[in-house]
């Protein structure tokens, strides 16, 4: 096992005058030299002391010495003004040795018994220093048996002399455009035996300015220039200093972006040091003049390297670099004294020519062609056939550059076709019906594609029809030939439309009855609405009040007439609604399967027969007049009926449209 520390042999003992405890003889001289190990001292005290008293202890005495220093000369029994007796005092050697000398002269007036003393070695506490004496250690002193050691505060390192703390004050780099630096501990005395290096390193283009502030106190010499402690300032151009003494050095304008400050101290002295406040300057950039209708921020007396400004435009004006818009603009001053980008303009916001409104027009209110900030335009829809959807059509050019409605909308208003307009006032008949005149059924659509069928225009790009009429084309929508705006089935004069997609009700099952016999065709283009092409209205919630039993509806189409041929001219018939139970009963008997008539169907026709829709009319609309709105709406879709059209006791069966309003609205809004 490793050996522990080797403790010194104990040093202790007793001293006494010759013959003690008896009286001592005359003319005696006795000397003891006591030695303790290094780092220890000797402690001595008397348990008995009885010597002849004499002036300044000239006759008999005990003298204690440590090295060259006399610690005490003792005589008598008790101390007087000029003589000292040990009493209960304890005496300590200054180092590790103590000399004790006993002397008696040639005579004693009476017998004296001398002295007895005890001594022992004890550790010296080197960290305890007498007032006024230099401390053992610069910072922290640590005593231990037989010695001591020094340590330093954070930021310092112990010098090789093992007592002085040198400052760790090199390698500090200052990169801010201004700041302060000072000698370590300023304004307290700076540390000894230190070499400090401070660097100020700014971006190229800056010039450092040094100002010495508050006080300056660096050890100096009357004849030699700063031989002890000094401060030097070095730039890439020149060296300034050395500086010492008590006078604040003058401002130094370095004309450099890098500065090295060196501060060196020796082992002695007690001086407070120095403090530098540094700033920087650079070549100023031209003063930024705000463009018209703009302002500069921040406003400064001058702008130098790295300073920046932003331009903000007044409301209704926008930042532009030529034709290109900017959301924000900030310029930065460069080292050569120029701005890194040119000043933009604050141009009045121009919303540009407003977009064309399909089936409508736009009017400049503020002035012809005026499209700048706060300009007003008015959209309107083509009268009679179109109406504007929830919008007053007034738009203002706002600061964001968009035409904006009074409700804050930036999208165009919508011109919706007016629905349910008809030139017709009285009824007629189809199977046993009457010829339609122009404008009577402007929603009527002729669907060709395998068979002849019909449909009704909804809005300006949808057709409502029967599922069974377009079932075969559901996957080939483009095969449907859709014609409108004509009365004659074979006329070459019609408006052509093409299908983009066919949507058959998911509840419809082909060849298994006619429940949910409803479909929508989306047109690939909007059709232009006019007196001959106008959509039919969808029923309002209140529409059922116009579709009670015996209320009259009108069906139209080019289906089979009484002659057994497809009609050349569009035909129509006015027919009453039949009681639902009556109709259900009519189709309960063979050859019709039970449950043929469902709640999704309505029936119309005369019990006596003769007025009915027929093959070729499928998908066409059974329409009713809403007397409140004076608009025609679709109540039913021609779906199915008896084998022989217009048969007595049988009725035409129509898809009940009011049951499908949510389905229709969902399809139209989704697609």
């Amino acid at each position: 096992t490793p050996l522990g520390p080797k403790w010194p042999e104990p040093v202790f003992g007793r001293l006494a005058s010759p013959g003690f405890p008896g009286e001592y003889a005359n003319d005696q001289e006795r000397r003891w030299t006591l030695t303790a190990p290094p780092g220890y001292r000797l402690r001595l005290y008397f348990t008995h002391f009885d010597l002849e008293l004499s002036h300044l202890c000239e006759y008999d005495f005990v003298k204690l010495s440590s090295g060259a220093k006399v610690l005490a000369t003792l005589c008598g029994q008790e101390s007087t003004d000029t003589e000292r007796a040990p009493g209960k005092d304890t005496f300590y050697s200054l180092g590790s040795s103590l000399d004790i000398t006993f002397r008696s002269d040639y005579s004693n007036e009476k017998p004296f018994t001398g002295f007895e003393a005890f001594y022992a070695a004890e550790d010296i506490d080197e960290c305890q220093v007498a007032p006024g004496e230099a401390p053992t250690c610069d910072h922290h002193c640590h005593n231990h048996l037989g010695g001591f050691y020094c340590s330093c505060r954070a930021g310092y390192v112990l010098h090789r002399n093992k007592r002085t703390c040198s400052a760790l004050c090199s390698g500090q780099v200052f990169t801010q455009r201004s700041g302060e630096l000072s000698s370590p501990e300023y304004p307290r005395p700076y540390p000894k035996l230190s070499s400090c290096t401070y660097s100020i390193s700014l971006e190229e283009g800056f010039s450092v300015i040094l100002d010495f502030v508050e006080s300056f106190d660096v050890e100096t010499h009357p004849e030699t220039l700063c031989p002890y402690d000094f401060l030097k300032i070095q730039t890439d151009r020149e060296e300034h200093g050395p500086f010492c003494g008590k006078t604040l050095p003058h401002r130094i304008e370095t004309k450099s972006n890098t500065v090295t400050i060196t501060f060196v101290t020796d082992e002695s002295g007690d001086h407070t040091g120095w403090k530098i406040h540094y700033t920087s300057t650079a070549q100023p950039c031209p003063y930024p003049m705000a463009p018209p209708n703009g302002h500069v921020s921040p406003v400064q007396a001058k702008y130098i390297l790295k300073d920046s400004f932003s331009i903000f435009c007044e409301t209704g004006y926008e930042l532009l670099q030529g034709h290109l818009p900017l959301k924000s603009f900030t310029a930065v001053c460069q080292k050569d004294g120029s701005w890194d980008r040119p000043m933009p303009a604050c141009s009045i916001v121009d919303c540009g020519p407003p977009d064309d409104l399909p089936s409508g027009r736009v009017e400049y209110i503020t002035g012809p062609g005026v499209t700048t900030y706060k300009a007003v335009i008015q959209y309107s829809c083509e009268e009679t056939f179109y109406t504007m959807k929830v919008n007053d059509g007034k738009y203002v050019c706002e600061a964001d550059g968009f035409w904006t409605s009074s409700k804050g909308e930036k999208s165009l208003p919508v011109c919706e076709p007016v629905c349910g307009l008809s030139a017709r006032t009285t009824g007629g008949q189809i199977y046993g019906g009457q010829k339609a005149k122009p404008g009577d059924f402007p929603w009527q659509v002729l669907i060709l594609g395998g068979t002849t069928a019909a449909g009704a225009l909804l809005y300006d790009n949808w057709v409502l029809t029967a599922a069974h009429a377009v079932y075969e084309q559901k996957h080939d929508a483009s095969a449907l030939d859709i014609r409108m705006g004509t009365l004659k089935r074979l006329s070459p004069h019609y408006t052509q439309a093409w299908s983009e997609a066919v949507f058959i009700h998911e509840g419809y099952t082909h060849d298994a009855g006619f429940d949910n016999d409803i479909a929508l065709i989306k047109l690939n283009n909007k059709v232009v609405i006019n007196s001959n092409i106008t959509p039919i209205c969808l029923p309002r919630k209140e529409a059922e009040s116009f579709m009670r039993t015996d209320d009259i509806g009108t069906a139209s189409g080019w289906g089979l007439t009484q002659r057994g041929f497809l009609a050349r001219n569009l035909m129509y018939v006015d027919i009453p609604i039949v009681d639902h139970q009556k109709c259900t009963a009519a189709y309960e008997k063979p050859p019709y399967p039970r449950g043929s008539v469902t709640a999704n169907m309505l029936c119309a026709g005369l019990e006596s027969g003769g007025k009915d829709s027929c093959r070729g009319d499928s998908g066409g609309a059974l329409v009713f007049l809403d007397s409140e709105t004076e608009r025609w709406f679709v109540g039913g879709i021609v779906s199915w009926g008896s084998m022989n059209c217009g048969e007595a006791g049988q009725y035409g069966v129509y898809t009940k449209v009011i049951n499908y309003i949510p389905w229709i609205e969902n399809i139209i809004s989704d697609f």
Partner: antibody, heavy 114, light 107 residues
Amino acid sequence: QVQLQESGPGLVKPSETLSLTCTVSGYSITSDYAWNWIRQPPGKKLEWMGYISYSGRTSYNPSLKSRITISRDTSKNQFSLKLSSVTAADTAVYYCSRHYGDYWGQGTLVTVSS
Amino acid sequence: EIVMTQSPATLSVSPGERATLSCKASQNVGTNVAWYQQKPGQSPRALIYSASYRYSGIPARFSGSGSGTEFTLTISSLQSEDFAVYFCHQYNANPLTFGGGTKVEIK
């Protein structure tokens, strides 16, 4: 680092609509600037087609105004070009760029041919 | 529209020599002019904006000047990588327009 990348079909039939998308990384198209579409027919000079600004406003070259639409999808940080009724004269390398051209896409060749 | 006319169409220069490229606008465009370098099969590379402001990363040998209708791009000492086509571009007014380009080739 700001990067722009064009994408879309390299071949379009006459009379159809040319559609291209520019995906921007390293910068939000709503933060600032104008975002341009520029094209260069083979052996010819560059032609500015239009831009969409940080706010969503558009500006088009009048020579293309009836056929061009520039839109954006801010959630994907993309802006798009649609050019309708194309002809062989629309065959070009199409570039997207930022503002006055500090960043460009690598370009994509679109050929109009049946 | 504003027409940007570049001259010469081709400039033959030896490496190390100075090249001066001209661009004239058909009407006043202020300083709203940019210059680009384009090499075959590559997209244009921005050199100068606002007539005289060099983009960061562009070597100091490239400099731009001019305002109003006359603009110049100067390459003080041509390096081998500088041989390319150079375009000027005005962004002062709609439509933004480009010059036809100047091809700088090795003499």
